[in-house]
């Protein structure tokens, strides 16, 4: 058991151009609060999936009112840590979502209104009992700076909070196979419940139900001494009881390797062999690598697959963030000029241009009617600089040179027959249909053919995510 702790340091505009507008105003004062959601392992990032490791809401921050004309500063934050207690072992690898919520304190009917300002997500490796890890994440134009750690609740210790501690029985050192409880050096790790009958003197276990033997002893319950030659050690005085040498202090005593690293002695000191995702002299540094598949939404991972290599994600269009976890509203940058309509298709941006403009961003002003002639009595119409002919009846095409057959496009629906007429076209409808284009079914009872409107949707609030 233990607690995941999150400390928010700042929430404000990120670096670069396009500083965000302040979320609060004199007319609408507001305050911030944060929500954290934790999931074990490298799990799905969907915000709606359950927070299997736990979730927490912060207190509300101080009320903030924007100073007119001033850029959005770092916003005032709630006091204290966000704490997510976990009952079982700490998984070591986890996914997080941190949401910044705004509570508007205007004259809303029915109490304050909540809206989500920013959401950041990521996946990290973290050993319990380690130091605070610092992080910076960006969501659009906002930047969130925070630190986090996982700590075990006594009597649990270890990188996964699965080992237990108890007060020392002897003043000098812990019993066989047991280590001091860092940072509680006056306590020792309590033995786990080993296999029934496992020798308390010569056996120990790292998992419940197992029985591993100390040097010099063997057998399923570590009760059989091996020959004394095999338990000779290059150091330490002889023990009268076992005939074996009891090790004296060495560089690997107390295991200086963190996060499950294994220690081996070298001629001068020691060397730690670290598990994947940890590195450093004592395996104290944690890092997710490309081998963990950390990039979302089809992003490509760049950086080594080996643990001492950091990674970055190359994000596809429309996504950003350190893990490509944030969708970009690219139309908010108003890329279409001259009043063009912006369409974000996911894989690309498209601009639908107003008449008279063209180009990928509607940047080209088309020629007007100057020097253009419309045939067959058509007249040139100026429309935002575009050349367009309004054709006389019976003619069509860009320059009114084509004789128009109004029935060519089969305009009559539901089997209606089309007749060309001097004023355009006429549809003779099949039985049961009516309208200028035979588009409406005739209902004998006069009931409407229109579908019912969908029911209204209730707006969400932060509680429904918890």
């Amino acid at each position: 058991a233990g607690v995941f702790e999150l400390q928010i340091h700042s929430f404000g505009p990120g670096p670069g151009p396009g500083a965000p507008r302040s979320p609060c105003s004199a007319r609408l004062p507001c305050r911030l609060f944060f929500r954290v959601c934790l999931k074990p392992g490298l799990s799905e990032e969907a915000a709606e999936s359950p927070c299997a490791l736990g979730a927490a809401l912060s207190a509300r921050g101080p009320v903030y009112t924007e100073q007119p004309g001033a850029p959005a500063p770092d916003l005032p934050l709630p006091d204290g840590l966000l704490q997510v207690p976990f009952r079982d072992a700490w998984p070591g690898t986890f996914s997080f979502i941190i949401e910044t919520w705004r509570e508007e304190l205007g004259d809303q009917i029915g109490g304050p209104a909540w809206s989500l300002l920013a959401r950041v997500a990521g996946r990290r490796r973290l050993a319990a009992g380690g130091p605070w890890a610092r992080d910076i994440q960006r969501a659009g134009a906002w930047e969130l700076r925070f630190s986090y750690r996982a700590r075990c609740e006594p009597p649990a210790v270890g990188t996964a909070c699965t080992r237990l501690c108890r007060p020392r029985s002897a003043p000098s050192r812990c019993g066989p196979g047991l280590r001091p409880c860092a940072p509680l050096e006056d306590e020792c790790e309590a033995p786990l419940v080993c296999r029934a009958g496992c020798s308390p003197e010569h056996g120990f276990c790292e998992q419940p139900g197992e029985c591993r033997c100390l040097e010099g002893w063997t057998g399923p319950l570590c009760t059989v001494p091996v020959s004394t030659s095999s338990c000779l050690s290059p150091r330490g005085p002889s023990s009268a009881t076992t005939g074996c040498l009891v090790p004296g202090p060495g560089p690997c005593d107390g295991n200086p390797c963190a996060n499950g690293g294994s220690c081996s002695e070298t001629p001068r000191s020691f060397e730690c062999t670290c598990p994947r995702g940890f590195y450093g002299l004592r395996c104290e540094v944690s890092g997710v690598t490309c081998a963990d598949g950390p990039c979302f939404n089809g992003g490509l991972c760049v950086g080594g697959a080996d643990p001492d290599s950091a990674y970055i994600c190359h994000c596809p269009p429309g996504f950003q963030g350190s893990n490509c976890e944030k969708r970009v509203d690219r139309c908010s940058l108003q890329p279409c000029r001259n009043g063009g309509l912006c369409l974000d298709l996911g894989h690309a941006l498209r601009c639908r241009c107003r008449a008279g403009f063209a180009g990928p961003r509607c940047e080209h002003d088309l020629d007007d009617c100057a020097g253009r002639a419309c045939a067959n009595g058509g007249t040139c119409v100026e429309g935002g600089g575009a050349h367009r002919c309004s054709c006389a009846l019976g003619f069509g095409g860009r320059d009114c040179r084509e004789r128009a057959d109004p029935c060519a496009a089969r305009p009559c629906a539901h089997g209606g027959r089309c007749y060309a007429h001097f004023s355009g076209l006429v549809c003779a409808c099949a039985p049961g249909y009516m309208g200028a284009r035979c588009e409406f079914p005739v209902h004998p009872d006069g009931a409407s053919a229109l579908p019912a409107a969908p029911p209204g949707l209730r707006p969400g609030d932060p509680q429904r995510y918890l």
Epitope: L42, S43, V302
Partner: antibody, heavy 119, light 111 residues
């Protein structure tokens, strides 16, 4: 329809640099995708060399990292491969290929250009 | 680096027969977050560049005949051609895109 066309010298001397151009038509290289160089050795072995993304980010095969560079000219809708200090082992057919982010698949390949490294 | 191996290196079959070829990776290509295996199969006919047949281990590229089927997960993958046609004469490559991109050694199909 997207078309990719490789061009460059067919013969390069050892220790010199190999430079190839991929000309793309039918799609802007700044709109989407990652634009790769892949080579196929005489024994048919395929090797991914690196890519440049629509926004200009690059990623290279670690074994080539010290001598490869992929750049682009967006005004000409072209991207380029430069491989330094070539040896006879770099003799291969070089393909420019675009890859799709969503599927991580090499969607469309050029016809390839054969390069021989020999003195 | 992820290493990809294919077997057999070549096989000769008659038209209409069923063919299976295998691809093995040195580490799992399954991403537990996206629930996808990042493995693709390519077909390279003589004198042509490779062409994608299957992606995500089992999803057929549009326009690819349904006699081509991909299967497998983790480290072991299979490409099956249910009834070989003369035009299927080609070399077939698997490729991983879980981390960077690595191609298999290829399986040459002779009719």
């Amino acid at each position: 329809d997207v078309q990719l066309q490789e061009s460059g010298p067919g013969l390069v001397k050892p220790s010199q640099s190999l430079s190839l151009t991929c000309s793309v038509t039918g799609y802007s290289i700044t709109s989407d995708f990652y634009w790769n160089w892949i080579r196929q050795f005489p024994g048919n072995k395929l090797e991914w060399m690196g890519y440049i993304t629509y926004d200009g980010s690059t990623n290279y095969d670690p074994s080539l990292k010290n001598r490869i560079s992929i750049t682009r000219d967006t005004s000409k809708n072209q991207f380029f491969l430069k491989l330094n200090s070539v040896t006879a082992e770099d003799t291969a057919t070089y393909y420019c290929v675009y890859g799709d982010f969503n599927r991580h698949a090499m969607d469309y390949w050029g016809q390839g250009t054969s390069v021989t490294v020999s003195s | 680096d992820i290493v990809m191996s294919q077997s057999p290196s070549s096989l000769a079959v008659s038209a209409g027969e069923k063919v299976t070829m295998s691809c093995r990776s040195s580490q799992s290509l399954f991403n537990s977050r996206t629930r996808k295996n990042y493995l693709a199969w390519y077909q390279q006919k003589p004198g042509q560049p490779p062409k994608v047949l299957i992606y995500w281990a089992s999803t057929r590229e549009s326009g690819v005949p349904d006699r081509f089927t991909g299967s497998g997960s983790g480290t072991d993958f299979t490409l099956t051609i249910s009834s070989v046609q003369a035009e299927d004469l080609a070399v077939y490559y698997c490729e991983q895109s879980f981390y960077l991109f690595t191609f298999g050694t290829g399986t040459k199909l002779e009719i």
